[in-house]
Amino acid sequence: QPDAINAPVTCCYNFTNRKISVQRLASYRRITSSKCPKEAVIFKTIVAKEICADPKQKWVQDSMDHLDKQTQTPKT
């Protein structure tokens, strides 16, 4: 079988129940693979720790929006 079929995917068992300060966050990625038990957002903190969060929670959505704005290239 091709490697891609058996390649593991990163998933989340559960979500943090603590809101993370946006100042501690460096980036995020969405987890939408059908191989995972649930959809999730994985935040990477400024110290490179990865934390699973619930994409349905408002603070998670707000944090993603904030990170998106941070990474947008300023218009010249």
Epitope: N6, P8, T10, C11, N14, I42, E50
Partner: nanobody, 126 residues
Framework: EVQLVESGGGLVQAGGSLRLSCAAS????????IAWFRQAPGKEREVVSC????????YYADSVKGRFTISSDNAKNTVFLQMNSLKPEDTAVYYC???????????????????WGQGTQVTVSS
């Protein structure tokens, strides 16, 4: 070919017992943990129990602690989930999966998910 095959599901009355089996083939059993998940209609999959094949360490969700017991027969590449004192809320499709590690205290840390089985239906009637 990698395969995870669940069996042992069925219909049981509340208070009864079932023993689920997850037979694995096509990969080196000792390199993975095996987790049992369940999914009830209209709900997300949740992890129920997990066992690390390498050291035998186990995990149980709070909702099944004291009622479910996970074990493995490494020689037969099979993991068992003994389910006692079943409740109607245990009704779900139960799936086993090969994963990188079982949940820890910090179970909001990501893990690697390799393969799912097809699932076995467990129905607990009141």
């Amino acid at each position: 070919e990698v395969q995870l095959v669940e069996s042992g599901g069925g219909l049981v009355q509340a208070g009864g017992s079932l023993r689920l089996s997850c037979a694995a083939s096509g990969f080196t059993f000792d390199d993975y943990a095996i987790a049992w998940f369940r999914q009830a209609p209209g709900k997300e999959r949740e992890v129920v129990s997990c066992i690390s094949s390498s050291d035998g360490s186990t995990y149980y969700a709070d909702s099944v602690k004291g009622r479910f017991t996970i074990s493995s027969d490494n020689a037969k590449n099979t993991v068992f989930l003994q389910m006692n004192s079943l409740k109607p809320e245990d009704t779900a499709v139960y799936y086993c999966a090969a994963v990188s590690n079982c949940p820890r205290d910090s179970d909001y840390i990501p893990y690697l998910h390799y393969w799912w089985g097809q699932g076995t239906q467990v129905t607990v009637s009141s």
